[in-house]
């Protein structure tokens, strides 16, 4: 234990300032993004060192579900994080320097709502205080953008292709290539979040191939080329 | 009580890497920095930079993140710190340091000593 | 980077006597907290670094209160009363405001 290192703090005669909590009204990022919810605050115990709690929570004020929480020893400028909603949240600030600013990553629409700081001293100076108006975030949807298109080897000397997009609402995918009828059956893969994957599992013909990515604000295309070198039977491609 | 313990002397051949480590006992290890520092003989003191062991978030100097990778075995409760293509610039007493406003302690430092 | 810099590279004094360690800054380390982000350390000779004074004007865990911190956003200084044979060594302040930290040159305490 060692509880009996603790160091001494000194008293100062500088007037103590009020429990109070900056943060703006509200914060814009598009879907796919990531958005910084900034929270700074004042408190009364100038020199507290003992140990505290970050939370954030999202919908209302005091009883919303927490979307992320950290804690941090005595004399500690590390905020261990005990709950991150999905791993997409993470502490930017230092609590110990009145900032629990927060970054959530890959944002949905569905993030889109008000969210709310709250610090806890949970020492001898048992105290806390939580932002009563929140910041709201406004995640805007974004149109669909293909973020990687490959060929890749298959079985028995095959190939596949591969497509993934992203977009809010996340993207419908199709495959359109030189084989007879054109457009070919896609595999809809599972995405996450705002990510979709598709796979071509067969490509029976050179030539190229096209994947289309399409949501309510857009549609966007990318193509893959197939050439295979086609040398004396038995040998491989 | 805090106690913070590294490795012993190390002598290396310029362009080879070598990994030191600090154990630490007395206190919770995954709650606090650890910080590393280096001193050359006759000189100052540099921070390298500093490691959560518990959440793995890493500071580095920019002037040591090509030299110096730490990293930190909450098992163990040691954290290490490898330092890659040593010159002669490299050699020195490096220190770890953690505990309460992550100086508190200090271990009894690592001398690295590149020569051919 | 913030540069810290400690001018006087040694500082004789008289056990018994009182002797002042300065430091500067190059920026406020001031925090908008309130807080002022300076350490103290005392290296003895063949020692590691001790901590001696946190936050510009703390006395760390275990230090003898004839050690006390003081300044303003970019002048520090340490003050040490009553100096002691055990005092001697080197001094060094540093900043933890930003990233890099920084430390200063050093200011090597010698008993006349």
């Known amino acids: 234990d060692a509880s009996g290192d603790l160091l001494n703090t000194e008293a100062h005669s500088a007037p103590a300032q009020r429990w109070s909590m900056q943060v703006p009204a509200e914060v814009n990022a598009e879907a796919g993004d990531a958005a910084v919810l900034p929270c700074t605050f004042t408190h009364p115990h100038r020199h507290y060192d003992g140990p505290l709690t970050a939370i954030w929570r999202s919908g209302e004020p005091y009883a919303g579900p927490q979307v992320f929480r950290c804690t941090a020893a005595p004399g500690s400028e590390l905020c261990q994080t005990a709950l991150s909603l999905h791993g997409r949240f993470r502490l930017l600030g230092n609590p110990r320097r009145n900032d629990l600013s927060l970054r959530v990553e890959r944002l949905a629409l569905a993030d889109s709502g008000r969210y709310f700081c709250r610090v806890e001293f949970t020492g001898d100076a048992h105290d806390r205080y939580e932002s009563r108006h929140g910041v709201r975030l406004r995640v805007t949807a974004a149109a669909p953008r293909i973020v990687n298109i490959s060929v890749l080897p298959g079985p028995a000397h095959a190939f596949r292709a591969l497509c993934t997009a992203e977009g809010e609402p996340p993207p419908a995918l199709a495959w359109s290539g030189p084989a007879p009828g054109n457009s070919s059956a896609a595999l809809q893969g599972q995405g996450h979040g705002y990510q979709v994957t598709a796979e071509l599992p067969a490509l029976t013909r050179d030539g190229r191939y096209t994947c289309t990515a399409a949501n309510s604000l857009g549609r966007a295309e990318a193509s893959v080329y197939l050439f295979r070198f086609h040398g004396a039977p038995g040998t491989s491609t | 009580q805090v106690q913070l313990k590294q490795s012993g002397p190390e002598l290396v051949r310029p362009g080879a890497s070598v990994k030191i480590s600090c154990e630490a006992s007395?206190?919770?290890?995954?709650?606090?920095?650890v910080n590393w520092v280096k001193q050359r003989p006759g000189r100052g003191l540099e921070w390298i930079g500093k490691i959560g062991p518990g959440s793995v978030s890493i500071y580095y100097n920019e002037k040591f993140k090509d030299k110096a990778t730490l990293t930190a075995d909450k098992s163990s409760s040691t954290a290490y710190m490898q330092l890659s293509g040593l010159t002669s610039e490299d050699s020195a007493v490096y220190f770890c340091a953690s505990y309460y406003y992550g100086f508190a302690y200090w271990g009894q430092g690592t001398l690295v000593t590149v020569s051919a | 980077d913030i540069v810290m810099t400690q001018a006087a590279p040694s500082v004789p004094v008289t056990p018994g006597e009182s002797v002042s360690i300065s430091c500067r800054s190059s920026?406020?380390?001031?925090?908008?907290?309130?807080?002022?982000?300076l350490y103290w350390f005392l290296q003895r000779p063949g020692q590691s670094p001790q901590l001696l004074i946190y936050?510009?004007?703390n006395l760390a865990s275990g230090v003898p209160d004839r050690f006390g911190g003081s300044g303003s956003g970019t002048a520090f200084t340490l003050r040490i009363s009553r100096v002691e044979a055990e005092d001697v060594g080197v001094y060094y302040c540093m900043q933890h405001l930003e990233y890099p930290y920084t430390f200063g040159g050093g200011t090597k305490l010698e008993i006349k």
């Open positions: 007395g206190y919770t290890f995954t709650d606090y920095y």
């Open positions: 936050r510009m004007s």
């Open positions: 920026k406020s380390l001031l925090h908008s907290n309130g807080n002022t982000y």
